[in-house]
């Protein structure tokens, strides 16, 4: 199976350098990795082509670095795609303004079919305006200005695969660049099930690993490996066989790891927060 990892360094964009790094551990170079803008998730983002370069620190990796460019050029949804033997694996992620009026509770949220779900956005700026919520760019919900809570929520009592997508929140007087984004991933199967008919029982994935609905395999969080994610990697390492290393001075600080669906994005062990720097 492919080992593809997308590192979203600082998904909340300010005036600091920000990057995307897509790593394919041990792949041969004639199976190229691509990084692009995910217009399916967010149509109205910047259309300038990305300057994708080889990551010199790794054998098979591509990188996009924004050095203090205008945030409007960065704000949006992205993907990294790898192909092997005709099969494509795509990892999705997002970058948004640190100065957004709301911030998501998490960058991605993975739930099982039928789950009772609350998608949450934290109010950062207080304004005398209605709050509005969109899904994949289409309006779904508004909250009158005097009723906007500190935590703005979208409630889905029985999540279905069609509920999956990019949810965004902003004040009604705002725009794309003052919006907060979070991506809801809904597994095709109910909890602990996998297979075309969802009638196979998942292996119990440990350490917050996620059962893949098509293969029944555990997708392990960064920093864990093994069939059930039972083995902890050495400090500051990640990847299916723990061969990749975080090169930062503080290890995996500010590394938001995004893995193929249905996993989504998370921090390495020991880090938390939207930026994985807490």
């Amino acid at each position: 199976a492919m080992d593809l990892i997308l590192i979203n360094s600082l998904p909340l964009v300010s005036d600091a350098e920000t990057s995307l790094t897509c790593i394919a551990s041990g792949w041969r170079p004639h199976e190229p990795i691509t990084i692009g803008r995910d217009f399916e998730a967010l149509m109205n983002q910047h259309q300038d082509p990305l300057e994708v370069t080889q990551d010199v620190t790794r054998e098979w990796a591509k990188k996009v670095v924004w050095k203090r460019e205008k945030a409007s050029k960065i704000n949006g949804a992205y993907f990294c795609e790898g192909r092997v033997r005709g099969e494509a694996i795509r990892i999705r992620t997002m970058k948004m303004r640190q100065q957004a009026s709301f911030l998501p509770a998490t960058l991605t949220m993975t739930v099982d079919k039928g789950d009772n779900v609350n998608i949450s956005f934290k109010k950062v700026l207080i304004k005398e305006e209605d709050a509005v919520i969109y899904k994949n760019g289409s309006f779904i919900h508004s909250v009158p200005r005097h009723e906007v809570p500190d935590i703005l929520e979208v409630h889905l009592p029985h999540a279905q695969p069609q509920d999956a997508g990019v949810y965004s929140a902003r004040y009604i007087g705002g725009n794309l660049f003052t919006s907060a984004f979070t991506r809801l991933i809904v597994r095709r199967c109910e909890a602990q099930k996998w297979g075309p008919e969802c009638n196979h029982l998942c292996t119990a994935c440990m350490n917050n690993g996620v059962c893949h609905e098509d293969t029944g395999e555990c997708i392990c969080p960064p920093g864990f490996m093994g069939r059930t994610c039972e083995k902890a990697c050495e400090l500051h390492t990640f990847g299916r066989t723990c061969k990749e290393r975080c090169s930062g001075q503080e290890g995996c600080k500010s590394y938001v790891f995004c893995l193929p669906d249905p996993y989504g994005c998370s921090c390495a062990t020991g880090w938390k927060g939207l930026q994985c720097n807490e």
């Epitope: 910047h46 259309q47 409007s72 309006f139 007087g173």
Partner: antibody, heavy 122, light 112 residues
């Protein structure tokens, strides 16, 4: 200070051309759609043209379609209106206006320039 | 094109009066979500217009609470609850549902 400053207005003969500029400052210019609105002497407001934040969407009033061209240079924080085949009825104060949106949808113009007068007369 | 008709075309009021201006559109401005695609602007002689209300009833930043927008579909109202000396100006409604964006002909509010 957030401001828009128009320039390029003046007296021009019918059939002539003029290029208006609008210099933006105090806000992130390429986060927003921009518009031109005009007002003939003693008359009401008339929307002329609009352009989205990344120039991906451009729209015109029927009265200027084919004669006027709206454009923007985000690297210079400047909006333009190229006006060709000018007519007497194009005589007006031309305002540039900032939208609150990045796209040409749910528009509202929260910042306006002081206006530049275009007079078309022989 | 959507036609916008304001009434009255002018009115006289005293400081402290409640002033109501109406705007009617030739087709509904109510979008699929509950917002109406209508803005209100104030313009003083020799000055640029100023945004007061957007999406029917949302007050723009810094606009005093005495200004309010209401209505839905094709009939809209701008209300100044207690008119102040600085409010004497011309007011315009504008529809933003479809291009071309169109303004009403204006309502001039004068001192009685």
């Amino acid at each position: 200070e957030v401001q828009l400053v128009e320039s390029g207005g003046g007296l021009v003969q019918p059939g002539g051309s003029l290029r208006l500029s609008c210099a933006a400052s105090g806000f992130t210019f390429d986060d927003y759609a921009m518009h031109w609105v005009r007002q003939a002497p003693g008359k009401g407001l008339e929307w002329v043209a609009g352009i989205s934040w990344n120039s991906g969407s451009i729209v015109y009033a029927d009265s200027v379609k084919g004669r006027f061209t709206i454009s923007r240079d985000n690297s210079k924080n400047t909006l333009y209106l190229q006006m060709n085949s000018l007519r007497a009825e194009d005589t007006a104060v031309y305002y540039c206006a900032k939208d609150i949106r990045e796209q040409l949808v749910e528009d509202a113009f929260d910042i306006w320039g002081q206006g530049t007068l275009v007079t078309v007369s022989s | 094109d959507i036609q916008m008709t304001q009434s009255p075309s002018s009115l006289s009021a005293s400081v402290g009066d409640r002033v109501t201006i109406t705007c009617r559109s030739s087709q509904s401005l109510l979008h699929s979500h509950r917002y109406n695609y209508l803005d209100w602007y104030q313009q003083k002689p020799g000055k640029a217009p100023k945004l007061l209300i957007y999406l029917g009833s949302n007050r723009a930043s810094g606009v005093p609470s005495r200004f309010s927008g209401s209505g839905s579909g094709t009939d809209f109202t701008l209300t100044i609850s207690s008119v102040q000396p600085e409010d004497f100006a011309t007011y315009y409604c504008m529809q933003t549902l479809q291009t071309p964006l169109t303004f009403g002909q204006g309502t001039k509010v004068e001192i009685k």
